[in-house]
C-alpha cells in the first residue's frame, strides 16, 4: 500500500490541524510580531537556534521574526508529532521504500555518511559501496587536479565540461558556483539545455587536448544529455583526427548503464555509477557530483558531505522544539496553509550563492509539486510552494517592493555569511551587505505607519503609498563563512525542510510524475517536425504554432 | 555480511558440460561487474568470463570463446557459469569475483572445484 508508512490520508484530519485553525482565527492572523517582541524580553533568545557544524563553525537560525508565538510553536510540533514525521523520517534514515509510488528508498543521506556507519538497504550494507564510489572520485580526481592524468597529446587536463541536465547539472553549477572561492586548477563549464547554443558556446572556449567531458546520466538515455554527449564526441573527433581511442583519455561516465556507456566509447573503468535510492535532485552528493571534486579538491567535497551529514545528525538526534529544520518545515506549513502564502522567497545575500535558489527551487517545487497523498487522495489543502529568489541586494532593486508594499504574503528567508571571501576595501562592501540583510529582515517586521510618513514630511494622497504595513515574516540564516561544510549544512538543511512539509502534506515528496507527459509528447512531435507535411494531429493552438514554425524553420 | 558462494562444480568426463552459480548476499548486486575466474594446480588465477552489472555485456578469454555462457538473475542475486565442451585443461578451482561499478570495491567466493577427466 502506498499509505504504509503514514495512518492518515489528509492532513486536515489532524486534530492538532483543527487546532491550528482556530488558533490562526483567534490570534494568528492579528499577531504582531512587533508587539511579541515587546511582550516577551526573550523571544529572540527562545527563537533563535545556533547549528554547529562539524568543525565547529556555526549557523544562527533565527525564528523570531516569524508570526508565531509559544503556543502557535507548540500546536506545530503537535501537529508533527500526529503527522508521524518523526516516524517518516526514521523509515528514511532505515533505508526503507518511503518513495512508495516507485517502491524505492530514498537513500540520499547515506551517500554523505562519513561516518561509515551501517545504513542498511533492502538487507544490504550500503556503506561500504559508498565508500568505495568515493575513493574512486578521490583517486580520479586526484589524478586529474595533479596532472598525473593526461589528454590524448599528454598535455594536462584544464578544463572540465560536464553534460547533464536536472539534477545532473543544476546541484553540480550551484555548487561550484557557491564555492569558487575555492577552485584551483581547472575551469568547469555546465551544458544541459538541448538548445544548440549551450553546447555551442561552451565548445568555442575549450581545447580538445585539455578537456575532459563528464557525461551524467544515470541511464545514459536521457534524451538532451545523450544528444549533447554526441555532439560533443562528433566536435572532438573532428578536432583530433577521427580517432576513437582518444576518446579514453577524455571522456568519463557517471551512469549505471555500462554497456551504453562502453558503446559510447567511454573507458568503463572511468564509468562512476549511484544507486536507483538516489532522486536527481538529491543527487549532488553523489557521484554526480564528481565535477565538484575535480573542481574544488577531493578533500573539500568530503567536507561538503560532511557539513550535510552534521545536518542529517541534528535533525535524527535533535528534539522536535530545538529541531532547527523541521522547525523551518513547520512555519512553510503554517504560511502554506493558514496565511494562505503560496510563495517563500530565498534571497542570499552572497553573490557567490547566486544559483542556490534555483537549485531550492527544483528540491522544492519538485518534491512537494503534489496534489495526491500517499493515501491516494487528491488534498484538500494547499502544497508545495512556489520558492524563488535571487541575490541581495540585486533583488532588493527588483522584486523586493512587492514582498513591502504588495498584497501577498512571502515569508522570506534570508541568508549571509559573516566573513566575505573577498572583505575588500577594509571590508566596506561586507558591511554594506550585511546592514542591509539586517535592515531588510527589520524594515519587513516593522514596517512604517502613516504617523511616521507624516512626521517624515508627507501630505495627503502621498500619505498611503508611503506605508509600510510590516509584520511581513523573515527567517534569518546568518552563518560564519560559507565553506564547503556550510553549503553542505545548508543544503541539508533545505532538504529535511522540505522532507517535513511533505511528511505533513502526506505527500511522496520523492518522485516526479509530474515531468514525464511533457517528455512523451515531445517525442511524438519531434517525428512530426521530421517531415513537411502539414500537422493536424493536435488541437487548433498546438497544429497551429507547429505548422508556423516548419514554415519558418 | 557479504557472502558468494559457490555451486554445481564436480567430476565430469571430457566433452560433458557444467553449470555453475554463484549466490550473492550483503551486496547491491545489480550493481555489480560479476566474473568468474579460474586457477589450476600450480598456476596463476585467470579470468574465464565477465558479465558487466546491467548484463548488456559478455567478455570471453579466448580459451572458453564459444564453449562457455556466462548470464545473471539479478532476482535472485545469482551469476551462471554454463560450461559446455569441457577439456581436461578446464580443470581447475572456479571462482566467482564482484567488483562494485568500476571502483576498488570487490568480493571473492571460497571456489568450487571442477575435475574433468575420464
Known amino acids: 500500500s502506498n499509505n504504509s508508512f503514514t495512518n492518515f490520508k489528509l492532513a486536515t484530519e489532524l486534530p492538532a490541524w483543527s487546532k491550528l485553525q482556530k488558533i490562526y482565527e483567534s490570534q494568528g492572523k492579528t499577531l504582531s510580531v512587533k508587539q511579541e517582541f515587546q511582550k516577551d524580553a526573550k523571544r529572540f533568545e527562545k527563537l533563535n537556534k545556533t547549528f554547529t557544524n562539524y568543525d565547529g563553525s556555526k549557523i544562527l537560525f533565527d525564528y523570531s521574526k516569524n508570526l508565531v508565538n509559544d503556543e502557535i510553536i507548540a500546536a506545530l510540533i503537535e501537529l508533527a508529532k500526529e503527522a508521524n514525521v518523526t516516524g517518516l523520517r526514521d523509515a528514511m534514515f532505515k533505508g526503507e521504500h518511503i518513495n512508495s509510488t516507485e517502491d524505492r528508498a530514498v537513500y540520499h543521506v547515506a551517500l554523505r555518511n562519513r561516518a561509515n556507519k551501517p545504513m542498511y538497504v533492502d538487507g544490504v550494507n550500503v556503506a561500504p559501496e559508498v565508500d568505495s564510489v568515493l575513493k574512486h572520485m578521490k583517486e580520479f580526481s586526484e589524478q586529474v587536479r595533479s596532472g598525473e592524468w593526461k589528454g590524448y597529446t599528454g598535455k594536462k587536463i584544464t578544463d572540465v565540461v560536464n553534460i547533464g541536465i536536472g539534477g545532473s547539472d543544476l546541484g553540480p553549477v550551484m555548487v561550484t558556483e557557491a564555492l569558487k572561492h575555492y577552485a584551483g586548477v581547472l575551469d568547469v563549464h555546465f551544458v544541459s539545455n538541448i538548445d544548440g547554443t549551450h553546447i555551442a558556446e561552451t565548445l568555442k572556449v575549450v581545447d580538445p587536448e585539455t578537456t575532459l567531458f563528464l557525461i551524467a546520466s544515470k541511464t545514459f538515455t536521457t534524451a538532451e544529455t545523450i544528444t549533447n554527449a554526441n555532439t560533443a564526441k562528433n566536435w572532438f573527433l573532428s578536432k583530433t583526427g577521427n580517432d576513437p581511442s582518444h576518446i579514453a583519455k577524455h571522456f568519463a561516465a557517471l551512469s549505471t548503464n555500462e554497456t551504453e556507456v562502453a558503446k559510447f566509447g567511454i573507458d568503463t573503468k572511468n564509468m562512476f555509477g549511484f544507486e536507483s535510492w538516489v532522486g536527481g535532485r538529491y543527487s549532488v552528493w553523489s557521484a554526480i557530483g564528481l565535477s565538484v571534486a575535480l573542481y574544488i579538491g577531493y578533500d573539500n567535497f568530503e567536507a561538503f558531505l560532511k557539513g550535510a551529514e552534521a545536518v542529517d545528525n541534528h535533525f535524527t538526534q535533535t528534539p522536535l522544539e530545538d529541531n532547527i529544520p523541521l522547525l523551518g518545515g513547520l512555519l512553510s506549513v503554517w504560511y502554506n496553509n493558514f496565511f494562505g502564502a503560496q510563495t517563500h522567497l530565498v534571497a542570499p545575500f552572497d553573490q557567490y550563492l547566486h544559483r542556490f535558489p534555483a537549485y531550492l527551487q527544483q528540491l522544492s517545487m519538485e518534491s512537494n509539486g503534489k496534489s495526491v497523498t500517499r493515501g491516494n487522495v487528491f488534498t484538500d489543502y494547499s502544497t508545495g510552494s512556489i520558492l524563488f529568489g535571487e541575490p541581495a541586494t540585486n533583488a532588493q532593486h527588483s522584486f523586493f517592493q512587492l514582498v513591502h508594499q504588495g498584497t501577498k504574503l512571502i515569508p522570506s528567508d534570508f541568508i549571509l555569511a559573516a566573513q566575505s571571501h573577498n572583505p575588500i576595501e577594509n571590508k566596506l562592501h561586507q558591511k554594506m551587505l550585511a546592514s542591509n540583510f539586517f535592515a531588510q529582515a527589520e524594515a519587513l517586521m516593522v514596517g512604517k505607519d502613516e504617523e511616521q510618513v507624516k512626521a517624515e514630511g508627507a501630505t495627503g494622497g502621498l500619505v498611503p503609498h508611503k506605508v509600510f504595513s510590516g509584520n511581513r515574516p523573515t527567517t534569518s540564516i546568518l552563518a560564519q563563512k560559507i565553506t564547503p561544510a556550510t553549503l553542505g549544512a545548508l543544503i541539508a538543511y533545505y532538504e529535511h525542510v522540505t522532507f517535513t512539509e511533505g511528511a505533513i502534506w502526506n505527500i511522496n515528496s520523492f518522485d516526479q510524475w509530474g515531468v514525464e507527459l511533457g517528455k512523451v509528447l515531445a517525442k511524438v512531435i519531434g517525428k512530426e517536425l521530421d517531415n513537411s507535411s502539414t500537422i493536424s494531429t493536435h488541437d487548433a493552438s498546438t497544429n497551429g504554432l507547429i505548422n508556423q514554425f516548419k514554415e519558418w524553420m | 555480511q557479504v557472502q558468494l558462494v559457490e555451486s554445481g562444480g564436480g567430476l565430469v568426463q571430457p566433452g560433458g558440460s557444467l553449470r555453475l552459480s554463484c549466490a550473492a548476499s550483503?551486496?547491491?548486486?545489480?550493481?555489480?561487474?560479476l566474473s568468474w575466474y579460474r586457477q589450476a594446480p600450480g598456476k596463476e588465477r585467470e579470468l574465464v568470463a565477465a558479465i558487466t552489472s546491467d548484463g548488456g555485456t559478455t567478455n570471453y578469454a579466448d580459451f572458453v570463446k564459444g564453449r562457455f555462457t556466462i548470464s545473471r538473475d539479478n532476482t535472485k542475486n545469482t551469476v551462471y557459469l554454463q560450461m559446455n565442451s569441457l577439456k581436461p585443461e578446464d580443470t581447475a578451482v572456479y571462482y566467482c569475483?564482484?567488483?562494485?561499478?568500476?571502483?576498488?570495491?570487490?568480493?571473492w567466493g571460497q571456489g568450487t572445484q571442477v575435475t574433468v577427466s575420464s
Open positions: 550483503g551486496i547491491t548486486f545489480p550493481s555489480y561487474r
Open positions: 569475483k564482484a567488483q562494485y561499478f568500476s571502483t576498488p570495491l570487490t568480493y
